[in-house]
């Protein structure tokens, strides 16, 4: 399990242990039970951060 702050993935993606791969958080609405989606929920997407600096 990736420790917080140690994810090798770029912004907007999250690590899937199941697939051994960074996966796009944009797929989570269609597949909300994917293991990597927990990592996507941990931080708001980049455009949210721009709204609330």
């Amino acid at each position: 399990e990736q420790a917080p702050g140690t994810s090798p993935c770029s912004s907007g993606s999250s690590w899937s242990a199941d697939l051994d791969k960074c996966m796009d958080c944009a797929s989570c609405p269609a597949r909300p039970h994917s293991d990597f989606c927990l990592g996507c929920a941990a931080a708001p997407p980049a455009h949210f951060r721009l709204l609330w600096p």
């Epitope: 399990e1 899937s16 242990a17 199941d18 697939l19 051994d20 791969k21 996966m23 796009d24 797929s27 269609a30 597949r31 909300p32 039970h33 994917s34 293991d35 927990l38």
Partner: antibody, heavy 123, light 111 residues
Framework: QVSLKESGPGILQPSQTLSLTCSFS??????????VSWIRQPSGKGLEWLAH???????RYNPSLKSRLTISKDTSRNQVFLKITSVDTADTATYYC???????????????WGQGTSVTVSS | DIVLTQSPASLAVSLGQRATISCRAS??????????MHWYQQKPGQPPKLLIK???NLESGVPARFSGSGSGTDFILNIHPVEEEDAATYYC?????????FGGGTKLEIK
């Protein structure tokens, strides 16, 4: 309807390169999250995962065989390939390809398998 | 590599009774939220067939007499009541990390 079918040489000699083809239908390897694995099974024995290729051409290999394996794909022709170099009698097995794909609950394990192709390495 | 050890290697169960197959992993295949363990059935001359994914989720079309449970390193496949068509070899498989590995198999015979 998803289906996969493996093809190979049947018999080859030690030290040769084994080339296998997986031809599939009913899904596309251009779909995000999709992938195909190769697995082998010596007669009367268990299953060994060999390699996996993703829709984005990312590849994963079993470390115990990595130096001998090459997986590749032709997305437009719905085919995945596996090459194993320097084969030996220990590589005699039935070789399967199987799909891993996305569903609502996340990502399937290997949910669809081909019937397998038998490979014998003999001098 | 995570080694999956299945037990027993073979078992014979009377028609209508319960079959219990164990799969023990050499290290945890679970996280706080997921257990990456799957079960397959293989009959002679056929490829494996996915039965259960992520410990307990029945694959579409698989009869409800199959069930899975467990977490961490210890997992169970139960079949109850056993039917004639369940005679097969059963394999566990994890996807917690690479390489994905399989258990050695359990051969189920129906008495």
């Amino acid at each position: 309807q998803v289906s996969l079918k493996e093809s190979g040489p049947g018999i080859l000699q030690p030290s040769q390169t084994l080339s296998l083809t997986c031809s599939f239908s009913g899904f596309s390897l251009s779909t995000s999250g999709m992938g195909v694995s190769w697995i082998r099974q010596p007669s009367g024995k268990g299953l060994e995962w060999l390699a996996h290729i993703y829709w984005d051409d990312d590849k994963r290999y079993n470390p115990s065989l990595k130096s001998r394996l090459t997986i590749s794909k032709d997305t437009s022709r719905n085919q995945v390939f596996l090459k194993i170099t320097s084969v030996d009698t220990a590589d005699t097995a039935t070789y399967y390809c199987a799909r891993r794909g996305p569903d609502y609950y996340g990502y399937y394990p290997m949910d669809y398998w081909g019937q397998g192709t038998s490979v014998t390495v003999s001098s | 590599d995570i080694v999956l050890t299945q037990s027993p290697a073979s078992l014979a169960v009377s028609l209508g009774q319960r079959a219990t197959i164990s799969c023990r992993a050499s290290k945890s295949v679970s996280t706080s939220s997921y257990s990456y363990m799957h079960w397959y059935q293989q009959k002679p001359g056929q490829p494996p067939k996915l039965l259960i994914k992520y410990t307990s989720n029945l694959e579409s079309g698989v009869p409800a007499r199959f069930s899975g449970s467990g977490s961490g390193t210890d997992f169970i496949l139960n079949i109850h009541p056993v039917e004639e068509e369940d005679a097969a070899t059963y394999y566990c498989q994890h996807s917690r990390e690479l390489p994905w590995t399989f258990g050695g198999g359990t051969k189920l015979e129906i008495k």
